[in-house]
């Protein structure tokens, strides 16, 4: 089975760890695919190690473990993320994470201060 936090949040400009945990008494993980909606983020295989898709190579760092660290987040990164665990002999297991990227607290505070500053 796959265990994961179904919903996570992070600040714009910050980073977040995407993590799925696979547990099985018999099956061994052979490959893990990570996707942002339909778009490939990265792949890990026992044979080949990690490959980060070139589209994300400046923002995605493999790990910890079989997860990913997604950096320099933007509001456009809000959405569904999927981990797919290929196992032998157990087959394929999928997990889903919804990431909400929020405006950074610095931006919110700065905006509030600006809006309430005296005019004179």
């Amino acid at each position: 089975t796959i265990d994961t936090k179904r919903n996570i949040s992070a600040e714009e400009g910050g980073s977040v760890i995407l993590q799925c945990h696979f547990s099985s008494d018999t099956a061994e993980v052979t490959q893990v695919d990570w996707k942002q909606q339909d778009q490939l983020l990265a792949i890990y295989s026992v044979d080949l190690g990690w490959h980060v898709a070139s589209v994300f190579s400046d923002r995605v760092v493999p790990g910890p473990s079989l997860g990913l660290t997604f950096q320099s987040l933007t509001m456009n990164d809000t959405g569904e993320y999927f981990c797919t665990y290929h196992t032998y002999p157990g087959g394929i297991y999928k997990g889903r994470i919804f990431l909400k990227v929020q405006e950074s607290s610095d931006d919110r505070n700065g905006l509030a201060q600006f809006q309430t500053a005296p005019l004179g």
Epitope: Q31, D38, Q39, L40, S45, L48, A53
Partner: antibody
Framework: EVQLLESGGGLVQPGGSLRLSCAAS????????MHWVRQAPGKGLEWVSS????????SYADSVKGRFTISRDNSKNTLYLQMNSLRAEDTAVYYC???????????WGQGTLVTVSS | DIQMTQSPSSLSASVGDRVTITCRAS??????LNWYQQKPGKAPKLLIY???SLQSGVPSRFSGSGSGTDFTLTISSLQPEDFATYYC?????????FGGGTKVEIK
């Protein structure tokens, strides 16, 4: 530098057999799935067969199933395609190809021409 | 089997032109779509993998987009060395299948 070098092509009569080889170098051959893809003269690309890194998973196109056999020898860094009961429609350039993560073909050999004709 | 339909089958263009080639799958293939370039007498060369990722060493004028069933390869400014035949290929399931190819010729 990754290199894939096919050999074993040639002229063979219908019903005959050929064994193609692909010698790999410049990478850890035993870690990669390998495929055969062919291209008939003046035509497009057609996938033929694949074998995963430890030969535990093998697949064939319907057009060659029962006639072609893919295999590999990781100790020799070599991929093979045994082709039996050859037909005129098997005439093509045969490419061996490296497929990381079972996802894309990142390297191709230069190809070897198989001509089936009487 | 998943059918891959490429269009157009051929096109004529000039150096500097923006060129767009489309590929449609007969069922959803997520982002399991790759693009290759082939020149006469040569083996194909990988350009784009996973629908939108540029293969190392490929010029940035090549780009790919799409997911599901509809995909596009774009050459932003055609160069003399880009005149070739381009193929899409799905790796969602076996048998792996290729599009019929698009031949890009000099106008």
């Amino acid at each position: 530098e990754v290199q894939l070098l096919e050999s074993g092509g040639g002229l063979v009569q219908p019903g005959g057999s050929l064994r193609l080889s692909c010698a790999a170098s410049g990478f850890t051959f035993s870690s990669y799935s390998m495929h055969w893809v062919r291209q008939a003269p003046g035509k497009g690309l057609e996938w033929v067969s694949s074998i995963n890194s430890n030969a535990g998973t093998i697949s064939y196109a319907d057009s060659v199933k029962g006639r072609f056999t893919i295999s590999r020898d990781n100790s020799k860094n070599t991929l093979y395609l045994q082709m039996n009961s050859l037909r005129a429609e098997d005439t093509a350039v045969y490419y061996c190809a490296r497929v990381p993560y079972d996802y894309w073909i990142d390297y191709w050999g230069q190809g070897t021409l198989v001509t089936v004709s009487s | 089997d998943i059918q891959m339909t490429q269009s157009p089958s051929s096109l004529s263009a000039s150096v500097g032109d923006r060129v767009t080639i489309t590929c449609r799958a007969s069922q959803s293939i997520s982002s399991y779509l790759n693009w290759y370039q082939q020149k006469p007498g040569k083996a194909p060369k990988l350009l784009i993998y996973a629908a939108s990722s540029l293969q190392s060493g490929v010029p940035s004028r090549f780009s790919g987009s799409g997911s599901g069933t509809d995909f596009t390869l774009t050459i932003s400014s055609l160069q003399p060395e880009d005149f070739a035949t381009y193929y899409c290929q799905q790796s969602y399931s076996t048998p792996l299948t290729f599009g019929g190819g698009t031949k890009v010729e000099i106008k």
